[in-house]
Interface confidence: medium
């Protein structure tokens, strides 16, 4: 996590800063948004537990052609220690449940805010 922050960052970013930046980006793409995100695309729901960053990326990476979540995908890749490609699935996916991207992002956002308040930055 010490290398998070993307191309614009001058150096390593503390995990707390990286998590807050991810939260901020999720807020940016959901605030006052009523139109379906990514044209209403559906993604696999995930268990919001340990390893959820990779699971979240595995779900969202299957959404293509949606500029609104491209930055989120890049940021999530910084939290995931291994390379993720489309079609890849982990045990954290709830494989029988698909939800809209907008709902997925809102659920993830609220969970990340909970983690941030609890000081769980990793």
């Amino acid at each position: 996590l010490t290398c998070l922050g993307g191309f614009a960052s001058p150096g390593p970013v503390p995990p707390s800063t990286a998590l807050r930046e991810l939260i901020e980006e999720l807020v940016n793409i959901t605030q006052n948004q009523k139109a379906p995100l990514c044209n209403g695309s559906m993604v696999w729901s995930i268990n919001l537990t340990a390893g959820m960053y990779c699971a979240a990326l595995e779900s969202l990476i299957n959404v293509s052609g949606c500029s609104a979540i491209e930055k989120t995908q890049r940021m999530l890749s910084g939290f995931c220690p291994h390379k993720v490609s489309a079609g890849q699935f982990s045990s954290l996916h709830v494989r029988d449940t698909k939800i809209e991207v907008a709902q997925f992002v809102k659920d993830l956002l609220l969970h990340l805010k909970k983690l941030f308040r609890e000081g769980q930055f990793n």
Partner: antibody, heavy 126, light 108 residues
Framework: EVQLVESGGGLVKPGGSLRLSCAAS????????MSWVRQAPGKGLEWVGR??????????NYAAPVKGRFTISRDDSKNTLYLQMNSLKTEDTAVYYC?????????????????WGQGTTVTVSS | SYELTQPPSVSVSPGQTARITCSGD??????AYWYQQKSGQAPVLVIY???KRPSGIPERFSGSSSGTMATLTISGAQVEDEADYYC???????????FGGGTKLTVL
């Protein structure tokens, strides 16, 4: 009881400065997105700007007419929102309201907006 | 800069239905909010996220949205509903708030 109380208004000359405060109580202020809205005499409501909660990045946005002259800040330890107004113009004369922001409330964990203060009057005149 | 457009005034008789419109290019993707402001008082939220009514707001207040137009409907308007009504939303970025010019509702 959820409450917002503005203070700091008054008469100031063009080019002068003023700092408004908004004291919040009855809700988790640190989770709240907060806005300033103003209303010139006999005119409609005008959005001035908004500050997000720190956990949501603390981002501050301003309306074009005040950008570069007004500064919004917050002190979560004091449950207080501020509006620093510099280079005041006669057209800044208005009642200034602070309010919790519905847009942010939806994603927070407090029951939001619509809580408004009763407003504080700012008069810019020579 | 982004604008929301409302009619300056609407008049109805008591018991009639009042409709106040608000148009804006971003309304297909951004929610509208409606505020009631009586003379000398702070605004009160009567509708949020296009159609939702806060607790304590009478059922006669409802909201709808279609395309670039949001509408506040007061079914069976009463004398106490006489006030200025403002729509509020954000620009397409979601970062900048904007109010409509306001509509003066007269219940004669």
């Amino acid at each position: 009881e959820v409450q917002l109380v503005e203070s700091g208004g008054g008469l100031v000359k063009p080019g002068g400065s003023l700092r408004l405060s908004c004291a919040a109580s009855g809700f988790t202020f640190s989770n709240a997105w907060m806005s300033w809205v103003r209303q010139a005499p006999g005119k409609g409501l005008e959005w001035v700007g908004r500050i997000r909660s720190k956990i949501d990045g603390g981002t501050i946005n301003y309306a074009a007419p005040v950008k570069g002259r007004f500064t919004i800040s917050r002190d979560d330890s004091k449950n207080t929102l501020y509006l620093q107004m510099n280079s005041l113009k006669t057209e800044d004369t208005a009642v200034y309201y602070c309010a919790t922001d519905q847009v942010g409330a939806y994603y927070g964990d407090y029951y939001g907006m619509d809580v408004w203060g009763q407003g504080t009057t700012v008069t810019v005149s020579s | 800069s982004y604008e929301l457009t409302q009619p300056p005034s609407v008049s109805v008789s008591p018991g009639q239905t009042a409709r106040i419109t608000c148009s804006g290019d971003a309304l297909p993707e951004k929610y509208a909010y409606w505020y009631q402001q009586k003379s000398g008082q702070a605004p009160v939220l009567v509708i949020y996220e296009d159609t939702k009514r806060p607790s304590g707001i009478p059922e006669r207040f409802s909201g709808s949205s279609s395309g670039t137009m949001a509408t506040l409907t007061i079914s069976g308007a009463q004398v106490e509903d006489e006030a200025d009504y403002y729509c509020y939303s954000t620009d397409s970025s979601g970062n900048h708030g904007v109010f409509g010019g306001g509509t003066k509702l007269t219940v004669l």
